[in-house]
């Protein structure tokens, strides 16, 4: 990996749990200054592999609300607006990091957690041909 | 919002920065026990809106490596394997949380950061009609 020269102004790390436990500032810095995060909000309807968005809420997690995509069809929408079953709608998934309250119900103590979320759907050529 | 009953066994929160600064355990708990995160690894090639994956590395960020999708074409691939310009390939983007070392180069002090990443591409009906 890349070795990072240590900044002498770093907070004290003599904690017995170090480096397992770190301090995190929850004031979120948003790097998306040149982009519109709502930009892809209509793709779910215009895609040839359209999807619905489902709200997944968990107060013990940060962020507490995550939107999950569920493909509407097994096949993809063709030029006539019909479902073409020679193609497959599939979810595009991504592993993301979230913070899980640990111990439970604690406002200032978390553990990193990795979860797999479906972000949207794409239309693919099938590789399994077992349907009539 | 949902009120969370406080656990009496929570760590002390008398820090002057509380609740802005919290403790986070970096031992990642992986919730994806019933899923294969590699499952969608071939979709980038089989999609009608195929994409390439590019490595984005930043040692000051956790995770330091993020893979970003870059659509291959302006249009979408049709049944003949050619690019069809009556449709548009577009990136599906998601805002994710990462940890940014703050102050820089510190191993045990971070700030939450929100970044927008392209996860894959999907094929959509165009709304911008500016091409021949």
């Amino acid at each position: 990996g890349i070795t990072i020269p240590r900044n002498p102004g770093c907070p004290n790390s003599e904690d017995k749990n170090f480096p397992r436990t770190v301090m995190v500032n929850l004031n979120i810095h948003n790097r998306n200054t040149n982009t519109n995060p709502k930009r892809s909000s209509d793709y779910y309807n215009r895609s040839t592999s359209p999807w619905n968005l489902h709200r997944n809420e968990d107060p013990e997690r940060y962020p507490s609300v995550i939107w999950e995509a569920k493909c509407r069809h097994l096949g993809c929408i063709n030029a006539d607006g019909n479902v073409d079953y020679h193609m497959n709608s599939v979810p595009i998934q991504q592993e993301i990091l979230v913070l899980r309250r640990e111990p439970p119900h604690c406002p200032n103590s978390f553990r990193l957690e990795k979860i797999l979320v479906s972000v949207g759907c794409t239309c693919v050529t099938p590789i399994v041909h077992h349907v009539a | 919002g949902i009120t969370i009953p406080r656990n009496p066994g929570c760590p002390n929160s008398e820090d002057k920065n509380f609740p802005r600064t919290v403790m986070v355990n970096l031992n990642i708990h992986n919730r994806n026990t019933n899923t294969n995160p590699k499952r969608s690894s071939d979709y980038y090639n089989r999609s009608t809106s195929p994409w390439n994956l590019h490595r984005n590395e930043d040692p000051e960020r956790y995770p330091s490596v993020i893979w970003e999708a870059k659509c291959r074409h302006l249009g979408c691939i049709n049944a003949d394997g050619n690019v069809d310009y009556h449709m548009n390939s577009v990136p599906i983007q998601q805002e994710i949380l990462v940890l940014r070392r703050e102050p820089p180069h510190c191993p045990n002090s971070f700030r939450l950061e929100k970044i927008l990443v392209s996860v894959g591409c999907t094929c959509v009906t165009p709304i911008v009609h500016h091409v021949a």
Partner: nanobody
Amino acid sequence: QVQLVESGGGLVQVGGSLRLSCEVSGLPVSSYAMGWFRQAPEKEREFVAAISWIGGDSRYAHFVKGRFTISRDNAKNTVHLQMDSLKPEDTAVYYCNDMPYGLDTRMDEYEYWGQGTQVTVSS
């Protein structure tokens, strides 16, 4: 921050040719398409041509189709616009830009523009 530097404009006679270049730096990792645009005096900026970085496939506005050719040099992060059979109505300032959503990008979504390069076609 994306930096865009356009060059290659000038004064040319009707029927003549010019080759515009656009050097780009600071592109997002996910950037997949680049476009050329133009703005004539007292007119709105309009799309001219687009190309994908990976596939190299291109698209053109109807008014330049068959006369202009867009190309890219991935190694140098440069996009070119070869303009042939130029007409007086091609007179404008020409700009290049990253197209974050490819052909789906709307004109109001571009946050930054370079200085552009002036093309003047005289009869």
